[in-house]
């Protein structure tokens, strides 16, 4: 089966790589604009130059193109704790990230929030904090993992999942009490 191609892809596929078909004259292939520039005017004829202009401040194109406008630079979302890793240039969008000892939680494909890496108090680091994943903690005896924090088994209620993790500790306490009564 031939994959479905959009009109623009169909038109571009007629021309060699790095060129696109003139929108008003399909016998002409124009050279695409370099990254950092956009299409101001199509080439007037075969072998003639495409009129490409550099993107203005606050906009960019990251690959060769025949876009009529540059793309607007992304802004890092302060409300999500994001910081700017590198500024927008004519050929590269803004790069946003998180501060040191933070990781990204993605709410959707392009939207992330920065959270502090867990310190694993009352436990040990099983897997270190990474760019897109919090620290994975292993809790000491007498503690259970709740929302990636080690919480004392004294806070474990019967209805919670922690009963399985804290049960050996509870049994040990009972066993010690029993042995003391002999």
């Amino acid at each position: 089966l031939v994959p479905h191609l959009g009109d623009r892809e169909k038109r571009d596929s007629v021309c060699p790589q790095g060129k696109y078909i003139h929108p008003q004259n399909n016998s002409i292939c124009c050279t695409k604009c370099h990254k950092g520039t956009y299409l101001y005017n199509d080439c007037p004829g075969p072998g003639q130059d495409t009129d490409c202009r550099e993107c203005e401040s606050g906009s960019f194109t990251a690959s060769e193109n025949h876009l009529r406008h540059c793309l607007s630079c992304s802004k890092c979302r302060k409300e999500m704790g994001q910081v700017e890793i590198s500024s927008c240039t004519v050929d590269r969008d803004t790069v946003c990230g998180c501060r040191k000892n933070q990781y990204r939680h993605y709410w959707s494909e392009n939207l992330f929030q920065c959270f502090n890496c867990s310190l694993c108090l009352n436990g040990t680091v099983h897997l270190s904090c990474q760019e897109k994943q919090n620290t994975v903690c292993t809790c000491h005896a007498g503690f259970f993992l709740r929302e990636n924090e080690c919480v004392s088994c004294s806070n474990c209620k019967k209805s919670l999942e922690c009963t399985k993790l804290c049960l050996p500790q509870i049994e040990n306490v009972k066993g010690t009490e029993d042995s003391g009564t002999t």
């Epitope: 939680h105 709410w107 959707s108 494909e109 392009n110 939207l111 929030q113 959270f115 929302e147 990636n148």
Partner: nanobody, 120 residues
Framework: EVQLLESGGGLVQPGGSLRLSCAAS????????MGWVRQAPGKGLEWVSF????????YYADSVKGRFTISRDNSKNTLYLQMNSLRAEDTAVYYC?????????????WGQGTLVTVSS
């Protein structure tokens, strides 16, 4: 068919409280980030609060921090928004949304909204 049905809106005096609910069906609720988005009269959409499936990660807009609390009950496929110390500027239509789907066919994953009016 994806369905998100909000309830709990109404008229409340400044300083009052409301609890919004959103019953979800037609998709695996436990796999998705969920949230509340609002639209005040004549204004654009504003993110209010998000929550991830295990309720570990939450987001609150600065304008509602300390007053609103988001929660979810995965066993009931329901999302909640507890709204305390309500202000006139909280007046808006509140939409329940599958946040994970932002940027795709987002409006397939939104409810019809529930109106919250804060007025004396």
């Amino acid at each position: 068919e994806v369905q998100l049905l909000e309830s709990g809106g109404g008229l409340v005096q400044p300083g009052g409280s409301l609890r919004l609910s959103c019953a979800a069906s037609g998709f695996t609720f436990t796999r998705y980030n969920m949230g509340w988005v609002r639209q005040a009269p004549g204004k654009g959409l504003e993110w209010v609060s998000f929550i991830d499936p295990p309720s570990v990660h939450t987001y609150y807009a600065d304008s509602v921090k300390g007053r609103f609390t988001i929660s979810r009950d995965n066993s009931k496929n329901t999302l909640y928004l507890q709204m305390n110390s309500l202000r006139a500027e909280d007046t808006a239509v509140y939409y329940c949304a599958n946040i994970s789907q932002f940027g795709s066919n987002a409006f397939d994953y939104w409810g019809q909204g529930t109106l919250v009016t804060v007025s004396s």
